[in-house]
């Protein structure tokens, strides 16, 4: 009986072994097939051959003090994705802004030549004819147009004729509004920061919002105007003129924006000089916004050559006056504050000059001259508090002009002389103009470039005009790098585990099965 019993148990064991091995074999086979398919699918979708079709775009920023040409590049197949456009070149045109050519329009063609030729070199010849070129003029031309629509139109007409001579697809030159300048700057920085990309979990199709998706506000400072743009907490606005609605990548944004014409750093300085010379007792202006020992002669006719100084205009008993620097930050700050009329506000809250400003919300990117000036002063670090910035400005402005010239020998004196004023003006504008505080100062990030692209309105302008920002979220969201790595590792592990179990099953002695039964 014992032998029979042993035989029966051996048979049972053999049957179990056969049954288990068949099932396990099926499971392992199925698992490995799934893992291989998954690896191939993830690998192929993520690493499909890069599209050869690269597109280019050119935007000229015709600012009040100079013109810059930007060249952008992106893969054609991905033009509706977020963050795929990047800047490949910036060319600064030699000379002043185009509005200064009003009396010499015939020189505009030569003025633009170098940078347009540079674009010809950078962009492959085969792409020239399909590369759009846009020129946007900002506050310098807005001021010229205030003087005469014809004069502004004549300048743009010559610009258009000059740009049409190049082999690119010229799309026109126009004066953009202050609202557009603010809005496109906001779009640019949020596009580059990836704020419009609604990331999807690898196991879910539903986009989820994270705190990271809160957009940044945009602070732009030019020579003739300054813009503030952000999404306020309260969606209802007291001032419809300052409200913009966008639908970008499937999400609605209610944006506040305002452009302060005449409050760019150059025009603000002209305003301050025109204001201060009114009370000067003679043709010497002792100016706290310039370094001690600094001297410069200013023509009264130049002072009144801008619409921005009209409110301070008066007959002076001299044709010229001399600025004599005394380098006092506190006095300079006080003088600058007089440019902001804060006594009148027809809303619940204003910035200055009776312009509505909702409570500040979130982080802000401060770019263009905000960045250039603060970067020169070495004050762009996130760790530098507002109090520290003020201390540094006090120290900088009080430094003698001769010392400053020696310390910054490579910098043009015209620019070097104005950093004390510009830094003071930036602090005054942000703190008293826009109501940032010592606490909210840490929410201001001084930004020059984001992933190699300049922060500014030009990228946003091109994205809009080339219809590269869809209203709705594109259907297929590509995997993020981390999700891709996770999936590749996961399915590779599955394959490895399957292989190990397979080896164990088919290469282990019979006691392995005994233990299992």
């Amino acid at each position: 009986m014992k032998g029979t019993k042993d035989l029966t148990s051996q048979q049972k064991e053999s049957n179990v072994k056969t049954f288990c091995s068949k099932n396990i074999l099926a499971i392992l086979g199925f698992s490995s097939i799934i893992a291989v398919i998954a690896l191939l699918a993830v690998g192929l979708t993520q690493n499909k051959a890069l599209p050869e079709n690269i597109k280019y775009g050119i935007v000229l920023d015709a600012g009040s003090s100079h013109t810059s040409l930007y060249i952008y590049k992106w893969p054609a197949e991905k033009e509706n994705d977020t963050g795929v456009v990047h800047q490949v070149e910036e060319c600064r045109v030699k000379g002043p802004g185009i509005s200064k050519y009003v009396q010499k329009v015939n020189e505009i063609g030569i003025y633009l030549t170098d940078c347009m030729e540079r674009a010809r070199e950078v962009i492959p010849r085969s792409q020239h004819q399909e590369t759009p070129v846009y020129l946007g003029a900002t506050a310098g031309m807005r001021l010229l147009r205030m003087e005469s629509e014809e004069l502004a139109d004549r300048v743009l007409d010559v610009v258009e004729r000059s740009l049409s001579n190049y082999p690119f697809d010229f799309q026109g030159a126009r004066i953009i509004t202050g609202q557009e300048e603010g809005a496109y700057g906001w779009i640019t920085i949020n596009y580059l920061l990836g704020k419009f990309s609604q990331k999807t979990r690898w196991f879910s199709i539903v986009p989820y919002e994270t705190n990271n998706q809160e957009t940044f506000g945009a602070l732009d400072l030019g020579g003739a105007s300054t813009q503030i743009t952000f999404v306020p907490q309260n969606q209802t606005t007291e001032s419809p003129d300052n409200a913009l609605q966008f639908r970008l990548y499937g999400k609605d944004y209610n944006v506040y924006t305002h452009s302060f014409l005449c409050y760019g750093k150059d025009q603000a300085l002209w305003q301050k000089l025109a204001k201060d010379i009114q009370v000067a007792s003679n043709e010497i202006l002792r100016d706290p916004c310039f370094h001690p020992g600094y001297k410069k002669v200013v023509n009264v006719s130049d002072l009144y050559k801008t619409p921005c100084t009209k409110r301070f205009e008066m007959t002076l008993p001299f044709q010229q006056f001399e600025i004599q620097g005394i380098g006092n930050y506190q006095q300079c700050h006080q003088s600058v504050l007089e440019l902001f009329n804060t006594s009148y506000c027809p809303y619940s809250q204003c910035a200055f000059n009776g312009i509505f400003l909702p409570p500040l919300q979130g982080d802000f990117g401060a770019f263009s001259a905000f960045y250039f000036v603060m970067n020169f002063l070495n004050l762009t670090s996130e760790k530098v508090s507002q109090e520290k910035v003020t201390e540094m400005m006090k120290k900088f402005c009080s430094q003698p002009w001769e010392e400053i010239k020696t310390s910054y020998a490579g910098v043009k004196e015209k620019y070097l002389s104005e950093y004390c004023f510009s830094g003071t003006y930036i602090l005054s504008l942000l703190l008293q103009g826009y109501h940032f505080t010592a606490d909210s100062w840490e929410h201001i990030h001084f930004i020059g470039k984001i992933q190699g692209s300049d922060a500014g309105w030009t990228l946003g302008y091109m994205l809009n005009l080339t219809n590269m920002i869809p209203a709705e979220q594109p259907l297929s969201t590509p995997l993020s790098h981390s999700t891709y790595v996770f999936l590749m590792v996961l399915f590779s592990l599955v394959l490895v585990i399957v292989a190990i179990i397979g080896l164990l099953i088919f290469h282990k002695p019979s006691y392995f099965w005994k233990d299992m039964v």
Epitope: M146, E147, L151, D153, T306
Partner: antibody, heavy 123, light 105 residues
Framework: EVQLVESGGGLVQPGRSLKLSCLAS????????MNWIRQAPGKGLEWVAS????????SYADTVKGRFTISRENAKNTLYLQMTSLRSEDTALYYC????????????????WGQGVMVTVSS | DTVLTQSPALAVSPGERVSISCRAS??????MHWYQQKPGQQPKLLIY???NLASGVPARFSGSGSGTDFTLTIDPVEADDTATYFC????????FGAGTKLELK
């Protein structure tokens, strides 16, 4: 009410100089471009010189370039035309004229004209 | 210089419609303006930027055109409209047409 009153005209010998003045009232003078336009007896209108509101653009007709100088004193609401090396062909009625505006933008058309001042260049 | 050409004279009866033309030697966009001058008076602005009626000007006056060809229309003409009409361009430094003398029959 917008008013432009010219003065300083008269009879002058060829080669001599004369300075015309125009006193403006009834509007914010420094917000507007100003011009001198002349009309020879029995003839058409000829633009002479322009001075934009913020002096960004000062321009002259080829016939007077180098001889005439336009200027303005905003605090005194006054426009001037300094005429030198006068010729017989400069004989005309000289109008002080204000630039118009297209909404918020300046325009090179002429919306208000003074009565004119006569300049006669003769020996 | 941009030369503006006008027909020298026109004679119409009161109540009729009259069109005064002005042709520019080169395109001036819409920067064409019209003035009326009566004997012994300074010119008076009628139309600015091709088609905009100046303030205080009767709606009988209208302007049209762009580029090189422009028209001032008076409909209907009244006895008081006897005057010389000048066109002026401002695309380049200002120039005037020689004027069209409108007489009533």
């Amino acid at each position: 009410e917008v008013q432009l009153v010219e003065s300083g005209g008269g009879l002058v010998q060829p080669g001599r100089s004369l300075k015309l003045s125009c006193l403006a009232s009834g509007f914010t003078f420094n917000n507007y471009g100003m011009n001198w336009i002349r009309q020879a007896p029995g003839k058409g209108l000829e633009w002479v010189a322009s001075f934009s509101s913020s002096s960004t653009y000062i321009s002259y007709a080829d016939t007077v370039k180098g001889r005439f100088t336009i200027s303005r004193e905003n605090a005194k609401n006054t426009l001037y035309l300094q005429m030198t090396s006068l010729r017989s062909e400069d004989t005309a009625l000289y109008y002080c004229v204000r630039h118009g505006r297209y909404g918020g933008y300046g325009g090179f058309y002429f919306d208000y004209w003074g009565q004119g001042v006569m300049v006669t260049v003769s020996s | 210089d941009t030369v503006l050409t006008q027909s020298p004279a026109l004679a119409v009866s009161p109540g009729e419609r009259v069109s005064i033309s002005c042709r520019a030697s080169e395109g001036v966009k819409s920067y064409m303006h019209w003035y009326q001058q009566k004997p012994g008076q300074q010119p008076k602005l009628l139309i600015y930027k091709a088609s905009n009626l100046a303030s205080g000007v009767p709606a009988r006056f209208s302007g049209s055109g762009s580029g090189t060809d422009f028209t001032l229309t008076i409909d209907p003409v009244e006895a008081d409209d006897t005057a010389t009409y000048f066109c002026q361009q401002s695309w380049n430094d200002p120039t005037f047409g020689a004027g069209t003398k409108l007489e009533l029959k």
